[in-house]
C-alpha cells in the first residue's frame, strides 16, 4: 500500500494516527471521528489546547495518545463527550497542571503524564493520591515536578477539599412553614458552590440567595413530602469537590391504612402507616389489646429511603377460627392519631355446625372489610376432619 500523505492516516479498523510534523493545531474535523476507538497524535507542536469542542463526536474513543507535542492546557470538561475513554497518554508535552475534573467520571485504566514540566501545587493533589493508591499506572512513572523534585514528596497538609457546614432549623417544622438553610463554605481556592435540589420537586417553593462563602436557601410553604428528601450543598476548589446532604423533618399527624388479609407464607394483614415523627403502633383484636408473640407479630417491609410511609404486615403464622374477628391498628404521634379496622376470617369454626349438616373437610377462608367481600384463595390448606358422636 502507498504511504498515506495526509496529516492523519487510518490505523487498523477504527484507529487514526496523526504523526506528520506540525500538521495539526486542533482536533476538529478528524476523518471518521464518530467510529474512532483509538487516536494517536505525535509531533504536533501547534496543538496547544484540548477543549470540549475538540473531542465532540468521538463518543466511541477508548485510547487517546497525544505525545511529543505542544499541549499546554487540557480543559476540565475536555473529555465530557468521551465517556468510554480508558487509556490516556499525554506524555512529553508542556503540561504544568491537570485538573481533577478532567478525569472525573472516566474509568481510566491508564494515565501517562511523564515528561511534562508539572508544577507541584494543591491542584495536583489528586494525582499524588493516584500515585499513593497505585491507580492508572501512575506510580511506575515516578512523576517529577519541574525544579521541585518528585510529585510524591509534594507537601499536602494544606491541600484539602472545601469544608461545608449546613445549618438547619432546630425547632419543629410544620406543613406550610418557610425554612431557611444556610451553607457555610470554608477552604482555600474556592471556585464554585451551589445546591442540588433534584429530590425536592413539589415539596416546597425554592429560593436561593447569597454566594461564596455563605449560601442561603429558602424552602417556602413546605409539604410533608419534604421528609426524607436530601438537600445537598456542594463546593469545589482545585483539590476536589465536597458535598453535604441534610434532611428537613416536617411534622405531620399519624395516618393508617389496613388492607384485606392475604396468605403470604401463612397470613398477613397488610398495613401502611405514615406520620412524622414515626407513629407508635398498637393492635386491637375484637377491641382488646393484642399482645404480639412469635406467631402473631408486626413485620415491616424494608422502608423506601426517600419517604416516611412504612408498609408492613401483621403476621399470623397459624391462624385458626379463634383468630377470626376484627383487627384494629392504632397509630399515634404527638401531632395526631388514627386508626383503621378490618374483619378477617381465616378458618371456619369446626365446632359450629348442626349434626345434621355435612361434616366440613376443607375451608375457603373469606376476609372482608366494609368495601369488599371477595374470597381469598388459601393454598396448602390441610384437610380438616371432625368426627361427631351423637348420643
Amino acid at each position: 500500500a502507498a504511504p498515506c500523505p495526509d496529516a492523519c492516516c487510518p490505523h487498523g479498523s477504527s484507529g487514526l494516527r496523526c504523526t506528520r510534523d506540525g500538521a495539526l493545531d486542533s482536533l476538529h474535523h478528524l476523518p471518521g471521528a464518530e467510529n474512532l476507538t483509538e487516536l494517536y497524535i505525535e509531533n504536533q507542536q501547534h496543538l496547544q489546547h484540548l477543549e470540549l469542542r475538540d473531542l465532540r463526536g468521538l463518543g466511541e474513543l477508548r485510547n487517546l495518545t497525544i505525545v511529543k507535542s505542544g499541549l499546554r492546557f487540557v480543559a476540565p470538561d475536555a473529555f465530557h463527550f468521551t465517556p468510554r475513554l480508558s487509556r490516556l497518554n499525554l506524555s512529553f508535552n508542556a503540561l504544568e497542571s491537570l485538573s481533577w475534573k478532567t478525569v472525573q467520571g472516566l474509568s481510566l485504566q491508564e494515565l501517562v503524564l511523564s515528561g511534562n514540566p508539572l508544577h507541584c501545587s494543591c491542584a495536583l493533589r489528586w494525582l499524588q493520591r493516584w500515585e499513593e493508591e497505585g491507580l492508572g499506572g501512575v506510580p511506575e512513572q515516578k512523576l517529577q515536578c519541574h525544579g521541585q523534585g518528585p510529585l510524591a514528596h509534594m507537601p499536602n497538609a494544606s491541600c484539602g477539599v472545601p469544608t461545608l457546614k449546613v445549618q438547619v432549623p432546630n425547632a419543629s417544622v410544620d406543613v406550610g412553614d418557610d425554612v431557611l438553610l444556610r451553607c457555610q463554605v470554608e477552604g482555600r481556592g474556592l471556585e464554585q458552590a451551589g445546591w442540588i435540589l433534584t429530590e425536592l420537586e413539589q415539596s416546597a417553593t425554592v429560593m436561593k440567595s447569597g454566594g461564596l462563602p455563605s449560601l442561603g436557601l429558602t424552602l417556602a410553604n413546605v409539604t410533608s413530602d419534604l421528609n426524607r428528601k436530601n438537600v445537598t450543598c456542594w463546593a469545589e476548589n482545585d483539590v476536589g469537590r465536597a458535598e453535604v446532604s441534610v434532611q428537613v423533618n416536617v411534622s405531620f399527624p399519624a395516618s393508617v391504612q389496613l388492607h384485606t388479609a392475604v396468605e403470604m407464607h401463612h397470613w398477613c394483614i397488610p398495613f401502611s402507616v405514615d406520620g412524622q415523627p414515626a407513629p407508635s403502633l398498637r393492635w386491637l383484636f375484637n377491641g382488646s389489646v393484642l399482645n404480639e408473640t412469635s406467631f402473631i407479630f408486626t413485620e415491616f417491609l424494608e422502608p423506601a429511603a426517600n419517604e416516611t410511609v412504612r408498609h408492613g404486615c401483621l403476621r399470623l403464622n397459624q391462624p385458626t377460627h379463634v383468630n377470626n374477628g376484627n383487627y384494629t391498628l392504632l397509630a399515634a404521634n404527638p401531632f395526631g392519631q388514627a386508626s383503621a379496622s378490618i374483619m378477617a376470617a381465616f378458618m371456619d369454626n369446626p365446632f359450629e355446625f348442626n349434626p345434621e349438616d355435612p361434616i366440613p373437610v376443607s375451608f375457603s377462608p373469606v376476609d372482608t372489610n366494609s368495601t369488599s367481600g371477595d374470597p381469598v384463595e388459601k393454598k396448602d390448606e390441610t384437610p380438616f376432619g371432625v368426627s361427631v358422636a351423637v348420643g
Epitope: 401463612h266 412469635s294 406467631f295 408486626t298 413485620e299 403464622n317
Partner: antibody, heavy 117, light 106 residues
C-alpha cells in the same frame, strides 16, 4: 449457613445469676424471634421465653417471669438470657432457637449450666 | 397453659415396622409441631404445621391430626429413627412441649 453459637458450659453457685449468650450468623438477626428453651437432665423441653430483636418485644413463661431476662445486642447479632437466684433445679442445658414464620427452625448447640457450691 | 400429653412414653419397634405415637392437647390447638432429639444433641425441627416435613426428613415420616389429637407416624421403622420425639404447640403463650416419646429399635 445459619448458625446459633452458644458457649459449651457454665458453672455457677446457688443464689447467683448466669448470663448466657447466643451469637447468630448467616441470616438477618432482626427478622427472627429468638426463643430460649431448657432441658433438665433426662427431662423434656421447657420454654422460657422469646424476644423479637426488631423491636425488643419479649414474652415470658410465667414460671420464669421474675427470674429470666431476655435481651439482644443487635450490633453483634447476639441474644442473651440472664437467669437469677439459681438453685440446683436450674441445672440444665439451655438452648436458643430462632423462628420467623415456622416454629423453631434452627437451634443452638446448647449451654450446659451446672449450679453447685 | 396448654398441656401436651405424649404416649407412649417409651416404645420400641423392629426395622420395617409401622410406628405411631400420639400427642393430646388439653385444649384445641390449630397445628402441632414435632422435634426429633438424639442423645447429646440439640432438638431438630422434624414435622411442622401438623403434616409438613422439615428439610431432609425422610418421607416415611408423616404427621396428622386436628383440634386436641395429633399423631406422628413412621411407615417403616429404620435404625436411624431411634430418638426421642417431642410435640409442641405454637398457638398460645407459654409455648409448651410434650414430655416426649422415646423410640428404640428392637
Amino acid at each position: 449457613q445459619v448458625q446459633l453459637q452458644q458457649p459449651g458450659a457454665e458453672l455457677v453457685k446457688p443464689g447467683a445469676s448466669v448470663k448466657l449468650s447466643c451469637k447468630s450468623s448467616g441470616y438477618t438477626f432482626t427478622n427472627y424471634w429468638m426463643h430460649w428453651v431448657r432441658q433438665r437432665p433426662g427431662q423434656g423441653l421447657e420454654w422460657i421465653g422469646e424476644i423479637y430483636p426488631n423491636n425488643g418485644r419479649v414474652n415470658y413463661n410465667e414460671k420464669f417471669k421474675n427470674r429470666a431476662t431476655l435481651t439482644v445486642d443487635i450490633s453483634s447479632s447476639t441474644a442473651y438470657m440472664q437467669l437469677s437466684s439459681l438453685t440446683s433445679e436450674d441445672s440444665a442445658v439451655y438452648y436458643c432457637a430462632r423462628s420467623r414464620y415456622d416454629p423453631m427452625e434452627d437451634w443452638g448447640q446448647g449451654t450446659s449450666v451446672t449450679v453447685s457450691s | 397453659q396448654v398441656v401436651l400429653t405424649q404416649s407412649p412414653a417409651i416404645m420400641s419397634a423392629s426395622p420395617g415396622e409401622k410406628v405411631t405415637m400420639t400427642c393430646s392437647a388439653s385444649s384445641s390447638v390449630g397445628y402441632m409441631h414435632w422435634y426429633q432429639q438424639k442423645s447429646g444433641t440439640s432438638p431438630k425441627r422434624w414435622i411442622y404445621d401438623t403434616s409438613k416435613l422439615a428439610s431432609g426428613v425422610p418421607t416415611r415420616f408423616s404427621g396428622s391430626g386436628s383440634g386436641t389429637s395429633y399423631s406422628l407416624t413412621i411407615s417403616s421403622m429404620e435404625a436411624e429413627d431411634a430418638a426421642t420425639y417431642f410435640c409442641q404447640q405454637w398457638s398460645s403463650i407459654p409455648l409448651t412441649f410434650g414430655s416426649g416419646t422415646r423410640l428404640e429399635i428392637k
